[in-house]
């Protein structure tokens, strides 16, 4: 058992069916010594009397707020919340399994740039009674500081029959250095409870990898004279690290039909424009990458060839 | 939300099988854990068996382990609960529930009820 925070314990519960359980000893927070006894929840029932209470738990059912009273008179609290590991893994209920980039990736980051701030999401189909807080720090054995606000809901989808709600929260390493080799990882820890389960997610990350740019600003198109060819051109996004002289990126040219399925005209470069055949109701978009790390694509930035 | 309906009840002799069903409508019914229940007149409601959200873990109550069977089919939205050797003392309205903490034998733990069906037990 451990403390997740002030009156708050986590009994970490190794379950099979037949499991004996955790035996947890409850010590009620006063100088009183005489009197005293114990209720679980609302309930009336009296569990047991004297400072301590001794109980053995199995399942949910013996989670919850247990309070210590003397004479009608509350003395303190414990809420017992349950952290369940069924053969040998611990239980990953509350959030969804975003299955990218690969199998059990349950929070998913992302930075628009090297300034060391960066945005976490996951995604649950659990609409009440549902708490997050997120930890992070750069490397584990002697973590440096990162800061992160609050999660917060960030949207709502619904898929089929059922409600999806994402949360997200934003950190900022508190001393980053954006030109900066990265020896240690980031890592964010995401402690979820939900009712009375108590579950922990984490994620380890160099930012680097997690590179995102925003699309291209300013994207313009200038015909050329007696000819079917634009220039098509755009800018960095505000959002990128500067010096682009030495954070530079690479941008991908697209010329894309009104259907899918016509071929679609490619151009890279490292420039910020470029000249290429503008067809009939066809769309011109640009996307930006780390001109010296493969990391993410940005989104598409669009205009109509017209 | 996910509403469960139950249905199978029925009068039958002692020693006899008797497999009831809940049927779950509304949302991702893979997305909960499920119990039965049973209540007897005069008597708290009473845990009978859980199974988890997969289907992969089950949970029973002393009085019925080694008799009554839960299972689920998600691809049709149902639960069992298969009962045999059944006693007397088996008689009671028996609930479907659903909810989001596993193994739980206590019924607040269940967000959403059934109304339940009747299964009478004759000696």
């Known amino acids: 058992i451990w403390e997740l925070k002030k009156d708050v314990y986590v009994v970490e519960l190794d379950w099979y069916p037949d499991a004996p359980g955790e035996m947890v000893v409850l010590t009620c927070d006063t100088p009183e010594e005489d009197g005293i006894t114990w209720t679980l929840d609302q309930s009336s029932e009296v569990l047991g009397s004297g400072k301590t209470l001794t109980i053995q738990v199995k399942e949910f059912g013996d989670a919850g707020q247990y309070t210590c009273h003397k004479g009608g008179e509350v003395l303190s609290h414990s809420l017992l919340l349950l952290h369940k590991k069924e053969d040998g893994i611990w239980s990953t209920d509350i959030l969804k399994d975003q299955k990218e980039p690969k199998n059990k990736t349950f929070l998913r980051c992302e930075a628009k740039n090297y300034s060391g701030r960066f945005t976490c999401w996951w995604l649950t189909t659990i609409s009440t009674d549902l708490t997050f807080s997120v930890k992070s720090s750069r490397g584990s054995s002697d973590p440096q500081g990162v800061t992160c606000g609050a999660a917060t809901l960030s949207a709502e989808r619904v898929r089929g029959d059922n409600k999806e709600y994402e949360y997200s929260v934003e950190c900022q390493e508190d001393s980053a250095c954006p030109a900066a080799e990265e020896s240690l990882p980031i890592e964010v820890m995401v402690d979820a409870v939900h009712k009375l389960k108590y579950e922990n997610y984490t994620s380890s990350f160099f930012i680097r990898d997690i590179i995102k740019p925003d699309p291209p600003k300013n994207l313009q198109l200038k015909p050329l004279k007696n000819s079917r060819q634009v220039e098509v051109s755009w800018e960095y996004p505000d959002t990128w690290s500067t010096p682009h002289s030495y954070f530079s990126l690479t941008f991908c040219v697209q010329v894309q039909g009104k259907s899918k399925r016509e071929k679609k005209d490619r151009v890279f470069t490292d420039k910020t424009s470029a000249t290429v055949i503008c067809r009939k109701n066809a769309s011109i978009s640009v996307r930006a990458q780390d001109r010296y790390y493969s990391s993410s694509w940005s989104e598409w930035a669009s205009v109509p060839c017209s | 939300e996910v509403q469960p309906v139950e249905s199978g009840g029925g009068v039958v002799q002692a020693g006899e099988s008797l497999r009831l069903s809940c049927a779950a409508s509304g949302r991702s019914f893979s997305d909960y854990e499920m119990g039965w229940f049973r209540q007897a007149p005069g008597t708290e409601r009473e845990f009978v068996a859980t199974?988890?959200?997969?289907?992969?873990?089950?949970y029973y109550a002393d009085s019925v382990k080694g008799r009554f069977t839960i299972s689920r089919d998600n691809a049709k939205n149902t639960v069992y609960l298969q009962m045999s050797s059944l006693k007397s003392e088996d008689t009671a309205v028996y609930y479907c529930?659903?909810?989001?903490?596993?193994?739980?034998?206590?019924?607040?733990?269940?967000?959403?009820w059934g109304q339940g069906t009747q299964v009478t037990v004759s000696s």
């Open positions: 199974i988890n959200r997969r289907g992969s873990s089950t």
């Open positions: 529930a659903a909810g989001w903490l596993y193994p739980s034998s206590r019924s607040r733990d269940y967000d959403y």
